[in-house]
Interface confidence: low
């Protein structure tokens, strides 16, 4: 008779990433007997919640329950019923909620309270909803990609990750771009830090890591665009904003009240002689790039080296995984290949931004116009952030790897968050265990 795999003792975990623009639910699974092994947790499902981020429900909290229903029901289907009660559910809210909390702690608490009550209605082991800090977001993203890349494992890895599979145990830095914030996290060459706020110490699998991390609130791609518009409308002579970051022929009316809704535009706020203005695209990468650079204040630095806005940044070290919107945008623009140099990326962006809006709409007929219209800005912003913000160069550009998934799991903070909260990353190196996933009889 043929050997049959006995049913494994599988465990599951659920993490909801409540981002500024949307919420995603991730389901992870792992063999119970290998909880402390590195690289055994896998993502089995991602469910994108229909609608905006939870911070947008501040005036309609009664709709939050319905908003979360589809994805929570999907989790009910995917996870065996016998496992429901022991499956932990975590919700982490990021920069969208950080911004809401800045405006009103009371409103942010109300949203989280309704989210918690909604999630408590499901048969899972709900562990709470909270706003994670920018530092946590950076750290957990770094843990996620290095866990998935097998960087914490001392033994030979049993899976092959191309092209990231290397024999060295040097960790990857993590570059995360969201809608409202962006994070940079890596192990610098020099172990001492000039800025304790940006320093983290981990002991993982028997090894110490001194990690630099910073989260730039308001510098996610959506908030950066609002900032840019608020900055540029200050000098507009009338209610028409000729914008180089949008394709020629593109037109869109923006309400001034929407522009000043976010705390991110407060520094540019002024009384305008109009309630609305019209963006008219002129599609010029170089001018767009110049406009974006004005968002990064590099005029002062109280440290030996800074990123921007006076934030300490040690010299870049090693390879970096760029994920979330870094990946989504560059993937859309077909610029994620390792072979594409920074000069080539810039050249392609110039070409893309200068294409007429009507042409773009025809070429990408299946893409929602709201998203399609912003790729020129987003691509330019990514280049500006990486090159001028973080000081990557044409040479070090080749050390940036745009990553969507690693071994079927999305790169992002959620896996690292769950690994930490379920105590699945031991401080010490666990005793060697068999590598097989199943027991055979």
């Amino acid at each position: 008779t043929q050997n049959k795999a006995l049913p494994e003792n599988i465990k599951y975990g659920i993490v909801l990433d409540a981002g500024s623009s949307h919420t995603s639910l991730y389901i992870y699974k792992w063999p119970a007997e290998k909880e402390n092994d590195t690289g055994v947790v896998h993502q089995v499902e991602e469910c994108r919640v229909k609608g905006p981020g939870i911070s947008k429900y501040v005036q309609k909290v009664n709709e939050i329950g319905i908003y979360l229903t589809d994805c929570m029901e999907r989790a009910r289907e995917v996870i065996p019923r016998s496992q429901h009660q022991e499956t932990p559910v975590y919700l982490g809210a990021t920069a969208g909620m950080r911004l809401l909390r800045m405006e009103s702690e009371e409103l942010a608490d109300r949203v989280l309270d309704v989210v918690e009550r909604s999630l408590s209605n499901y048969p899972f082991d709900f562990q709470g909803a909270r706003i994670i800090t920018g530092q946590e977001e950076g750290a957990y993203g770094w843990i996620t990609i290095n866990y998935l890349l097998g960087k914490f494992s001392q033994k030979t890895r049993w899976f092959s990750i191309v092209p990231y599979e290397t024999n060295n145990q040097e960790t990857f830095g993590a570059l995360d771009l969201g809608g409202a914030s962006t994070q940079i996290t890596f192990v610098p060459q020099n172990q001492t830090t000039e800025s304790p706020d940006n320093a983290l110490q981990f002991r993982l699998y028997g090894k110490d890591y001194n990690v630099y991390t910073h989260s730039f609130l308001c510098y996610g791609k959506d908030q950066a665009l609002w900032q840019k518009l608020a900055k540029d409308i200050q000098v507009a002579s009338n209610e028409i904003l000729r914008d180089p970051c949008f394709h020629p022929g593109y037109k869109k009316v923006v309400n001034v009240s929407d522009l000043y809704k976010t705390p991110c535009t407060k520094r540019f706020e002024m009384t305008l002689p109009f309630q609305q203005f019209e963006i008219q695209g002129i599609g010029n990468y170089q001018q767009c790039h110049q406009s974006v650079l004005e968002l990064f204040n590099t005029s002062y630095c109280p440290y030996s080296q800074c990123a921007f806005n006076g934030i300490f940044l040690p010299p870049l070290q090693g390879d970096f995984g760029a994920f979330s919107a870094f990946y989504f945008v560059m993937n859309f623009l077909n610029l994620t290949s390792e072979k594409v140099s920074q000069e080539k990326v810039t050249e392609m962006m110039k070409k893309f931004c200068s294409q007429p809006w009507e042409e773009i709409k025809t070429s990408y007929a299946g893409v929602k116009e709201k998203y399609l219209s912003e790729y020129c800005f987003s691509g330019t912003y990514i280049l500006s952030l990486l090159l001028q913000g973080y000081h990557f160069t044409a040479d070090s550009w080749e050390h940036i790897h745009f990553i969507g998934k690693i071994q079927g799991s999305d790169a992002g903070w959620t896996l690292g968050y769950m690994l930490n909260l379920t105590n699945m990353i031991p401080a010490e190196q666990p005793l060697s265990t068999p590598l097989s996933h199943s027991t055979y009889v």
Partner: antibody
Framework: QVQLVQSGAEVKKPGSSVKVSCKAS????????IGWVRQAPGQGLEWMGG????????NYAQKFQGRVTITADESTSTAYMELSSLRSEDTAVYYC??????????????WGRGTLVTVSS | EIVMTQSPATLSVSPGERATLSCRAS??????LAWYQQKPGQAPRLLIY???TRATGIPARFSGSGSGTEFTLTISSLQSEDFAVYYC?????????FGGGTKVEIK
């Protein structure tokens, strides 16, 4: 005690260039932005531009763009401001100043004594 | 660029009296505003930064207030050494512009 020591007074002909130096003594130099401010006789203060020595990248006020060059030499802890195509209205005292601020606020907390540049034919 | 307007241009005050100097920005500068004192033949000296924080060694009689576009420097009881020109400066947006100055003279 950090001090900013500037070069001596200069008399220049119209159309020529002047290069003023500003040396930091007794403390950190690279980690601070250095700004250049000028003051014409009997007039107010006018910001010209600035540099972060550790990066070597300078920013200039639009009014001086193309005529001013700000540089820094980390090895000697010295910042320089060169102004070209001089005209009589460039006659002024030129100050270098350190931006001692951090993430929240910025301010020129340390000033050089100033360098008088006289442009006269 | 952000235009900084100081008023009055000249303020005549008797020693021991209170002096109130005003500075207005053409657009919001948040609290990124500094005040400097300058005496004839000398370099400016930092008094206040962050709109209201006194710099090291500055006497308590100097105080700053305001945010956004309207700022005030108050000298509670003028001493003889306080008669000078006072400048405000915004450090929010390049170019880092100064106000035209207020001359505080003896009445």
């Amino acid at each position: 005690q950090v001090q900013l020591v500037q070069s001596g007074a200069e008399v220049k002909k119209p159309g020529s260039s002047v290069k003023v130096s500003c040396k930091a003594s007794g403390g950190a130099f690279s980690s601070y932005a250095i700004g250049w401010v000028r003051q014409a006789p009997g007039q107010g203060l006018e910001w010209m531009g600035g540099i972060i020595p550790t990066f070597g990248t300078a920013n200039y006020a639009q009014k001086f763009q193309g005529r001013v060059t700000i540089t820094a030499d980390e090895s000697t802890s010295t910042a320089y401001m060169e102004l070209s195509s001089l005209r009589s209205e460039d006659t002024a005292v030129y100050y270098c100043a350190r931006d001692g601020g951090g993430y929240q606020h910025h301010y020129f907390d340390l000033w050089g004594r100033g360098t008088l540049v006289t442009v006269s034919s | 660029e952000i235009v900084m307007t100081q008023s009055p241009a000249t303020l005549s005050v008797s020693p021991g009296e209170r002096a109130t100097l005003s500075c207005r920005a053409s657009q919001s500068v948040g609290s990124n505003l500094a005040w400097y004192q300058q005496k004839p033949g000398q370099a400016p000296r930092l008094l206040i930064y962050g709109a209201s924080t006194r710099a090291t060694g500055i006497p308590a009689r100097f105080s700053g207030s305001g945010s956004g576009t309207e700022f005030t420097l108050t000298i509670s009881s003028l001493q003889s050494e306080d008669f000078a020109v006072y400048y405000c400066q915004q450090l929010t947006k390049w170019p880092l512009t100064f106000g035209g100055g207020t001359k505080v003279e003896i009445k």
